[in-house]
């Protein structure tokens, strides 16, 4: 029985050219996390494997950094980075937990003047 829950940063916004941290946290379960996948639509950005560590997809290597923790840092953001991101926790014995984050990348002038989803 899957008892865990995933908390995420939810809907967030960031400025074009800036960076953002995507964070998920799995709680309320004693299941062992064997791997965390970070995915955007159908593209795999990175994995953090409990045995083999972090591995970033070659196509994102220049703009994605591992961490902090099991999170993922996106750098040099473009408007094309707007969209849904998923943290997929592979656990034993529970199975798979998935969290969703929506990122909106804004032109700098918009972000400076009270954008939706703005983080203080």
């Amino acid at each position: 029985m899957m008892t865990g829950t995933i908390e995420t940063t939810g809907n967030i916004s960031a400025e074009k050219g800036g960076s953002i941290i995507l964070q998920c946290h799995l709680s309320s379960t004693t299941a062992q996390v064997t791997q965390v996948n970070w995915e955007q639509q159908d593209q795999l950005l990175a994995i953090c494997n409990a045995d083999l560590g972090w591995h970033i997809s070659p196509s994102f290597k220049d703009r994605v950094a591992p961490g902090p923790g099991l999170g993922l840092t996106l750098q040099s953001l473009t408007v094309n980075d707007t969209g849904e991101y998923f943290c997929i926790y592979h656990t034993y014995p529970d199975g798979t937990y998935t969290g969703r984050i929506f990122l909106e990348v804004l032109e700098s002038s918009v972000a400076e003047h009270g954008a939706r989803f703005q983080i203080p």
Partner: nanobody
């Protein structure tokens, strides 16, 4: 599933070299990284080295940096661990591991490396 078979272990004197091989077969298409871990008698299994199958980027445990080199032959679905300047503390069972997008990791049966002084 992905099957992993290690080879190349053995008995060697301190300062010597060995080359471990790990051949992968089965559903290897979504294998994202491969690597090596080791377990010495009475100790926890520990990370040794890993390589990303996409671009060949590598990572090493501090204890083996400069002595061990991991490499991959994607055409043969094989990963190698060249171990030089071996020390008695490198004595362990060495396991090959694979990380897959599906989250279904795989392990080999292990190969024994014994370094004598």
């Amino acid at each position: 599933e992905v099957q992993l078979v290690e080879s190349g272990g053995g008995l060697v004197q301190a300062g010597g070299s060995l080359r471990l091989s790990c051949a992968a077969s089965g559903r290897t298409f979504d294998t994202y990284a491969m690597g090596w871990l080791r377990q010495a008698p009475g100790k926890e299994r520990e990370f040794v080295s890993a390589i990303s199958t996409g671009d060949g980027s590598t990572n090493y445990a501090d204890s083996v940096k400069g002595r061990f080199t991991i490499s991959a032959d994607n055409a043969k679905n094989t990963v190698y661990l060249q171990m030089n300047s071996l020390k008695p503390e490198d004595t362990a069972v060495y396991y090959c591991a694979a990380a897959r997008r599906s989250g279904r990791g795989s392990w080999g049966q292990g190969t024994q490396v014994t370094v004598t002084s």
